[in-house]
């Protein structure tokens, strides 16, 4: 090994990665909100819809104060990977009624993938556990009917909206601890 030499700074550092994750999450939240509104316009929802395969909401307003960086990032990554799988499934199996929303769903999927990559990079730079906790992956079968796929889309977009909402709050809070 030669004499010590400095390395130039790379494009970002963990705090910049966290800033970027917040921006990406906010932008994804806006996209999701807009797409959910489009869904309600085209296919009015009769009450709240749920899907057993979706992750349960990780946080409530009351638990925000006790958040720890590793737990938040791991849980957010696991939940977003589940939502990504559901969006992919919607695009594949949603049927003709959802084909009109294909460009928006495609853009949503691309943004989700980008956010997941940013979270992974952040976890890598912080040397936090990368492995997602083992969770049973519920196989996603084809929707029972056209109405079934519409209800699933309402549930997926609604759940993703709530998840991203707590994610923005959580990530902003964690910024102060890094």
């Amino acid at each position: 090994p030669g004499p010590p030499a400095g390395s130039p700074r790379v494009s970002s550092d963990p705090r910049a990665d966290l800033d970027s994750a917040v921006l990406l999450t906010r932008s994804l939240l806006a996209d999701t909100r807009q797409l959910a509104a489009q869904m309600r316009d085209k296919f009015p929802a009769d009450g709240d819809h749920s899907l057993d395969s979706l992750p349960t909401l990780a946080m409530s307003a009351g638990t925000l104060g006790s958040l720890q960086l590793p737990g938040v990032l791991t849980r957010l990554r696991v939940d977003l990977m589940s939502y990504l799988r559901h969006v992919q499934w919607l695009r594949r199996a949603g049927g003709p009624s959802l084909k009109t929303l294909e460009p928006e769903l495609g853009a949503l999927q691309a943004r989700l993938e980008r956010l997941l990559r940013r979270l992974q990079l952040l976890m890598s730079r912080l040397a936090l556990p990368q492995a997602a906790p083992d969770q049973p992956v519920i196989p996603l079968g084809p929707p029972a009917s056209a109405w079934g796929s519409i209800r699933a889309a309402h549930a997926i977009l609604g759940g993703l909206h709530l998840t991203l909402d707590w994610a923005v709050r959580g990530l902003l809070l964690l910024k102060t601890r890094l």
């Epitope: 390395s7 705090r15 990559r117 992974q120 040397a127 936090l128 990368q130």
Partner: antibody
Framework: EVQLLESGGGLVQPGGSLRLSCAAS????????MHWVRQAPGKGLEWVSA????????YYADSVKGRFTISRDNSKNTLYLQMNSLRAEDTAVYYC???????WGQGTLVTVSS | QSVLTQPPSASGTPGQRVTISCTGS?????????VHWYQQLPGTAPKLLIY???ERPSGVPDRFSGSKSGTSASLAISGLRSEDEADYYC???????????FGGGTKLTVL
């Protein structure tokens, strides 16, 4: 400019111990996970150990588990590797690295030989 | 034997485009983990070349690019130059080892 400066390498007999240090400057040390990666003469890179930004998570390659201990002192911007029960196959240049790793030191040579 | 498999050597003439592959498994690249690439010039420490599959750190020329698909990744170098002669390593997190793993390295020769 980012600098990582390793020290503490040298010649040691099999079964002996060494403590490597890595002094960091030019970046926010406490915001980065840190790694030790080694390279035996003429061979490829082998990850050895890592520690999270705050020291709460530590990881080890199977080949060093139970013999090496990684630690850090964020107040001193320094990373450490305590190496015990050293073997001939531990002979290598040991690099300290930060982040992905994004930044690497120049390395310190550890020779285990009788 | 490395967890990530790379060809031991690759070569090309100045101006050419060369590609170096990195093949993993379902516990690393196939599990969705990002791939990073390092360049090690003779007698020096490794340097980050590509991170997160295809992102370049500042200062790395756009002749270097990365991609990932399924359980493998690749590094492409276009407009090959004599100063690109070096060892190239891929790396990714591995679930079964609970840590990052490196490929065995590819020695690139510019003819």
């Amino acid at each position: 400019e980012v600098q990582l400066l390793e020290s503490g390498g040298g010649l040691v007999q099999p079964g002996g111990s060494l403590r490597l240090s890595c002094a960091a400057s030019g970046f926010t040390f406490s915001s980065y996970g840190m790694h030790w990666v080694r390279q035996a003469p003429g061979k490829g890179l082998e990850w050895v150990s890592a520690i999270s930004y705050d020291g709460s998570y530590k990881y080890y390659a199977d080949s060093v588990k139970g013999r090496f201990t990684i630690s850090r002192d964020n107040s001193k911007n320094t990373l450490y590797l305590q190496m015990n029960s050293l073997r001939a196959e531990d002979t290598a240049v040991y690099y300290c690295a930060a982040g992905v790793p994004d930044y690497w030191g120049q390395g310190t040579l550890v020779t285990v030989s009788s | 034997q490395s967890v990530l498999t790379q060809p031991p050597s690759a070569s090309g003439t100045p101006g050419q485009r060369v590609t170096i592959s990195c093949t993993g498994s379902s516990s690393n690249i196939g599990a969705g983990y990002d791939v990073h690439w390092y360049q090690q010039l003779p007698g020096t420490a490794p340097k980050l070349l590509i991170y997160s599959n295809n992102e370049r750190p500042s200062g790395v020329p756009d002749r270097f690019s990365g991609s990932k698909s399924g359980t493998s990744a690749s590094l492409a170098i276009s407009g090959l130059r004599s100063e690109d002669e070096a060892d190239y390593y891929c790396a990714a997190w591995d679930d079964s080892l609970n840590g990052p793993v490196f490929g065995g390295g590819t020695k690139l020769t510019v003819l």
